[in-house]
């Protein structure tokens, strides 16, 4: 029960980080023009991954794309990659998340398989909250640097006559929603993962081969651990060997109701 | 067609007040910045300062501030702009504009009040 | 506050001959977020209100006529009038409306020969 909580609770928590990492890739407020200790002007500027826009104090807003590719910074071409990879996998991640659900029964799939479809995405949804993280943070990195040099600009007064109504950049609403998204899908992704040990079996089974003393009789058992599904008295998952040497047949074999004997 | 109508004149005594009108017709009034402008004789235009009625958001000339209140009343569709403590300096005419939608310039003008301050 | 510069004070031309006034502002009215120039020219006829004739330093309000053309980014801007004709007898005045307090200059008054 609680590695089918887990388990959903990962995939919803990646599935709202994922929409965040969208959203946030999509929304033109990456950076918002200063407006403390700056010249009051009677336009906003904004920036997005794909647009710049310009709100005029009516209200008016007029948003151009960038149509260029080779024109644009490494910087945000880097940002725009590591955005659109972390929505790719996490994409891909929730698709596969969804067979992996323990609560949706598909044919006869195995819990090995979903186990490891389970990991698969949760890996997925940690590498694509590390790339949203990441994305965001260049980006923001890239604003402070240019904050900064923008700053001194406006002290030293550009060496010329002419002074410019310098627009300075701080960070916009995209970038918070992206490292809270980026964040959610990493915290998703690693609760998949937690799901998965749940899911798996914890260690090889065994069919063991017992050898008596008194050489009356050789037990095989094929029933090497008893699995938590109810049947018997062993719900703890613990070995159960007779004797003393132990032979290895098989790298899986599956809980039976029995011990033959 | 966007009309707005101001009052021709204002007489008025030295440290008195006036508050002069400018009423909007023929557009949503709440969408445009009301603007405000002095023209003295012989000299040039002066932006006093501007409101948006939508939310009474304001912004002020410096030069103005303690002069000139700018008001509006949405449901009369009118903006309007106390001047205190009037002087001589203070005789002009006043004009209201509105703002344009797409940029920030003043699209449309009203006549104009002549606001003379005599004893 | 910028300071918006205009010259010549006056100027008296021949109806049909071209004329050309500036306007020159003391920081750049150039936005970086849309390349527009935050400068609008205005005519005032005698007696009555100004009335708007381009924005965005080279864009023509609609209903004015093809003759008037902006011209100019940064710091100095221009108003050119192709062809003057009588009914051009006006000032005109160049405004900053990019940065608060929006300024105008003192003007430019065109008389007619």
């Known amino acids: 029960m609680a590695v089918t909580a887990c388990q959903g609770l990962g995939f919803v928590v990646s599935l709202i980080g994922i929409a965040g990492i969208i959203a946030a890739t999509c929304m033109d407020q990456w950076s918002t023009q200063d407006l403390y200790n700056n010249p009051v002007t009677a336009v906003f500027n904004y920036q997005g991954l794909w647009r710049s826009c310009v709100r005029e104090s009516s209200g008016f807003t007029e948003c151009r794309g960038y149509f260029t590719l080779l024109g644009l910074p490494a910087m945000l071409q880097a940002v725009r990659a590591l955005m659109i990879v972390g929505i790719v996998l996490g994409a891909i991640g929730l698709l596969v998340s969804i067979f992996a659900l323990k609560c949706i029964r598909i044919g006869s799939m195995e819990d090995s398989a979903k186990a490891n479809m389970t990991l698969t995405s949760g890996i997925m949804f940690i590498v694509s909250g590390l790339c949203a993280i990441a994305g965001v943070s260049v980006f923001a990195n890239m604003l402070v640097t240019n904050f900064w040099m923008s700053t001194a600009n406006m002290y030293t007064g550009m060496g010329g006559m002419v002074q410019t109504v310098q627009t300075r950049y701080t960070f916009g609403a995209a970038l918070f929603v992206g490292w809270v998204a980026g964040g959610l899908t990493l915290i998703g992704g690693v609760m998949m993962c937690i799901a998965c040990r749940g899911l798996a079996p914890e260690e090889t089974n065994y069919k063991a081969v017992s050898y008596h003393a008194s050489g009356h009789s050789v037990a095989y058992k094929p029933g090497g651990f008893k699995a938590s599904t109810g049947f018997g008295s062993n719900t703890k998952n613990k070995k159960i060997y007779d004797g003393g040497a132990r032979t290895e047949d098989e790298v899986q074999s599956y809980p039976s109701k029995h011990d033959y004997v | 067609l966007v009309q707005l109508q101001q009052p021709g004149a204002e007489l008025v005594k030295p440290g008195a007040s006036v508050k002069v009108s400018c009423k909007a017709s023929g557009s949503t009034f709440t969408t445009y910045w009301m603007h405000w402008v002095k023209k003295r004789p012989g000299q040039g235009l002066e932006w006093i300062g501007g409101i948006r009625p939508s939310d009474s958001n304001t912004n002020y000339n410096h030069k103005f501030k303690g002069k000139a209140t700018l008001t509006v009343d949405k449901a009369s569709s009118t903006a309007y702009m106390q001047l205190s403590s009037l002087t001589s300096e203070d005789s002009a005419v006043y004009y209201c504009?509105?703002?344009?939608?797409?940029?920030?310039?003043?699209?449309?003008w009203a006549q104009g009040t002549v606001v003379t301050v005599s004893a | 506050d910028i300071v918006m510069t205009q010259s010549p004070s006056s100027l008296t031309v021949t109806a049909g001959k071209k004329v050309t006034m500036n306007c020159k502002s003391s920081q750049s009215l150039l936005n970086s977020g849309n390349q527009k120039n935050y400068v609008t020219w205005y005519q005032q006829k005698p007696g009555q209100p100004p009335k708007l004739l381009i924005f965005?330093?080279?864009t023509r309000e609609s209903g004015v006529p093809d003759r008037f053309t902006g011209s100019g980014s940064g710091t100095d801007f221009s108003l050119i009038i192709s062809t003057v004709q009588a009914e051009d007898l006006a000032v005109y005045y160049c405004q900053n409306d990019y940065v608060y307090p929006f300024t105008f200059g003192s003007g430019t008054k065109l008389e007619i020969k």
């Open positions: 504009a509105m703002g344009a939608y797409y940029s920030n310039s003043f699209a449309y």
């Open positions: 965005w330093a080279s």
